[in-house]
């Protein structure tokens, strides 16, 4: 019953410009070209999808109009693949070009950059923004997609789409207000928050689908629609997750326009069959098709079936299990780990996937043993270890964040995680560690039955940060192993790592921590970021230090830029008393 | 690690049509393609398909005739050929890529004979 079954047409890039229309067709491409060539600039890539759009429109009038009928890739490709300084700018990337589609595209693909060496997004004064908003809103509204896209080069396309569209409402509404400032600052924070962790939990899918594969993350996908539709069937929950999967699919490979064609045609089977699905999505379903899609994407979990049977009688107890097993081993799992997720909600995801796992290992073992039943009839108590670590763990961190604070939380991690991996770049592990200090702020508040499925599906998003940032420049080997081995084990396999004892201490420099009066300009948010940064660079140099070592150094520190920041010759203070700091810390810490 | 087993070779009529498939394991999604090597002769681009399944490019030779496909959830390639004709008949090759484009992982090849 898949959804997206079409016919053949005569021309691939007319079909998709008649069914998106104009405006999210030069987006969409625009996105997807701004997401391959990172560093052209903005007036290129708007002349490129100019043109694009241009020939789209002839093949609208004629699809049988010369190379109306080429594929998108082919045509995407071959116009970045004119871009003048395509070898100066991107180097080895140029020899895509060399190639043929599908190959090219794929090479393309392998050369995204997770971490683009892009100047910072300053924002501007608000009256700046609002008179560039008026004088051309357009051009305002297309230089948002291109400078997210080109940041983010995974973005989930049609959820840009949706993003830019509350740009454009934030300014429509902010600009003829009384306090601009006031009205609009609080919409760009909140999204900008909202489009890093969107980006984020995006590239968790990408990793997932490019690196280990369409089944496990169709595994993802049962697990996470299961305990958001426990009324669907098992059928009607598959079907989602295939058309669901090759959405994915699409966007991942950089295939945007039959990525946000097919995402619109899964949110309307959605609303069209929401009897069969959940009950939560009415509301969803009466709004306009991006903030339809979004809502969708985001719906509360429906409530569960009261009459819920034991999933013993069915996985553990039938004579038939092996039986069932073999006959179709994934259809069997998929439906155990169906079965599974829609009595839990309270679980994480990645638990789910380790308890059908572990459930899978048995019946490969026990199927073929003298006494199946004999062999797998414990299978459950197996569970039990895996249920606890992860709920003791959030136990744990979150009565240290509500004892810490967000701030020292954050530093109890950088510490922790450096000792783990000295290795990686020191501006990683600060904006890693930040980030999953973060997941006390955002699930420790949570009862008891949310706190997990919170706290660790969001930390496997965060920890494919580290993995994707790793996997450009590889450091550790240990990083490595925990990124590659196994997809759900990512969390545990850091959790288990202790200090590692073959790092050879960074040489001490005193430059490193040498600070000056600017510190005293920046936000709450930046001088956090250059403290942590120091943190990192002391427990580089000294991997053995105590916390309370660390603790009375960075007690000082902070108390030298309070002393600092106070004095009238702020930039003799901070050389003076900096020297006295850093000597002081060294016999601190016995450097 | 990485294994491509290609099966569904064997000897057909001119005319005739045969469907060869290939099970990939070890490998995450990747573009994949069918090459081919007659007796004495170089080897032969003949089918590739990218990994959603939305682009696939033919060898002039077979454009029309041969349709390459997938299955992800099954980590399989397929090649239905029809039309066969005498100078079809080589070793046909499951490949895929490094990921870059370039094609780094083979199957050992199945043999397909058009002969009446």
């Known amino acids: 019953r898949g959804v997206f079954r079409r016919d053949a047409h005569k021309s691939e890039v007319a079909h998709r410009f008649k069914d998106l229309g104009e405006e999210n067709f030069k987006a969409l491409v625009l996105i997807a070209f701004a997401q391959y060539l990172q560093q052209c600039p903005f007036e290129d890539h708007v002349k490129l999808v100019n043109e694009v759009t241009e020939f789209a429109k002839t093949c609208v009038a004629d699809e049988s109009a010369e190379n109306c009928d080429k594929s998108l890739h082919t045509l995407f490709g071959d116009k970045l693949c004119t871009v003048a300084t395509l070898r100066e700018t991107y180097g080895e990337m140029a020899d895509c070009c060399a190639k043929q589609e599908p190959e090219r595209n794929e090479c393309f693909l392998q050369h995204k950059d997770d971490n683009p060496n892009l100047p910072r997004l300053v924002r501007p004064e608000v009256d700046v923004m609002c008179t560039a908003f008026h004088d051309n809103e357009e051009t305002f509204l297309k230089k948002y997609l291109y400078e997210i896209a080109r940041r983010h080069p995974y973005f989930y396309a049609p959820e840009l789409l949706f993003f830019a569209k509350r740009y454009k409402a934030a300014f429509t509404e902010c600009c003829q207000a009384a306090d601009k400032a006031a009205c609009l600052l609080p919409k760009l924070d909140e999204l900008r928050d909202e489009g890093k962790a969107s980006s984020a939990k995006q590239r968790l899918k990408c990793a997932s689908l490019q690196k280990f594969g369409e089944r496990a993350f169709k595994a993802w996908a049962v697990a996470r629609l299961s305990q958001r539709f426990p009324k669907a069937e098992f059928a009607e929950v598959s079907k989602l997750v295939t058309d669901l999967t090759k959405v994915h699919t699409e966007c991942c490979h950089g295939d945007l326009l039959e990525c946000a064609d097919d995402r619109a045609d899964l949110a309307k089977y959605i609303c069209e069959n929401q009897d069969s699905i959940s009950s939560k999505l009415k509301e969803c379903c009466e709004k306009p098709l991006l903030e339809k899609s979004h809502c969708i994407a985001e719906v509360e979990n429906d409530e569960m079936p009261a009459d819920l049977p034991s999933l013993a009688a069915d996985f553990v107890e039938s004579k038939d299990v092996c039986k069932n097993y073999a006959e179709a081993k994934d259809v069997f799992l998929g439906m155990f780990l169906y079965e599974y997720a829609r009595r839990h909600p309270d679980y994480s995801v990645v638990l789910l996937l380790r308890l059908a796992k572990t459930y899978e290992t048995t019946l490969e073992k026990c199927c073929a043993a003298a006494d199946p039943h004999e062999c797998y009839a414990k299978v459950f108590d197996e569970f039990k270890p895996l249920v606890e670590e992860p709920q003791n763990l959030i136990k744990q961190n979150c009565e240290l964040f509500e004892q810490l604070g967000e701030y020292k939380f954050q530093n109890a991690l950088l510490v922790r995680y450096t000792k783990k991996v000295p290795q990686v770049s020191t501006p990683t592990l600060v904006e890693v560690s930040r980030n999953l200090g973060k997941v006390g702020s955002k699930c420790c508040k949570h009862p008891e039955a949310k706190r997990m499925p919170c706290a660790e599906d969001y930390l496997s998003v965060v920890l494919n940060q580290l993995c994707v940032l790793h996997e450009k420049t590889p450091v550790s080997d240990r990083v490595t192993k925990c990124c590659t081995e196994s997809l759900v084990n990512r969390r545990p396999c850091f959790s288990a790592l202790e200090v590692d004892e073959t790092y050879v201490p960074k040489e001490f420099n005193a430059e490193t921590f040498t600070f000056h009066a600017d510190i005293c300009t920046l936000s709450e948010k930046e001088r956090q970021i250059k403290k942590q940064t120091a943190l990192v660079e002391l427990v580089k140099h000294k991997p053995k230090a105590t916390k309370e070592q660390l603790k009375a150094v960075m007690d000082d520190f902070a108390a030298f830029v309070e002393k600092c920041c106070k004095a009238d010759d702020k930039e003799t203070c901070f050389a003076e008393e900096g020297k006295k700091l850093v000597a002081a810390s060294q016999a601190a810490l016995g450097l | 690690q990485v294994q491509l087993v290609e099966s569904g070779g064997g000897l057909v009529q001119p005319g005739g049509s045969l469907r060869l498939s290939c099970a990939a394991s070890g490998l995450p999604s990747r573009v994949m393609g069918w090459f081919r090597q007659a007796a004495g002769k170089e080897r032969e681009f003949v089918a590739s398909?990218?990994?959603?399944?939305?682009?696939?490019r033919y060898g002039d030779s077979v454009k029309g005739r041969f349709t390459i496909s997938r299955d992800n959830t099954k980590s399989s390639l397929y090649l239905q050929m029809n039309s066969l004709k005498p100078e079809d008949t080589a070793v046909y090759y499951c490949?895929?890529?490094?990921?870059?484009?370039?094609?780094?992982?083979w199957g050992q090849g199945t043999q397909v004979t058009v002969s009446s």
């Open positions: 398909i990218s990994v959603s399944g939305i682009d696939t």
């Open positions: 490949a895929a890529t490094d990921g870059q484009g370039n094609y780094r992982h």
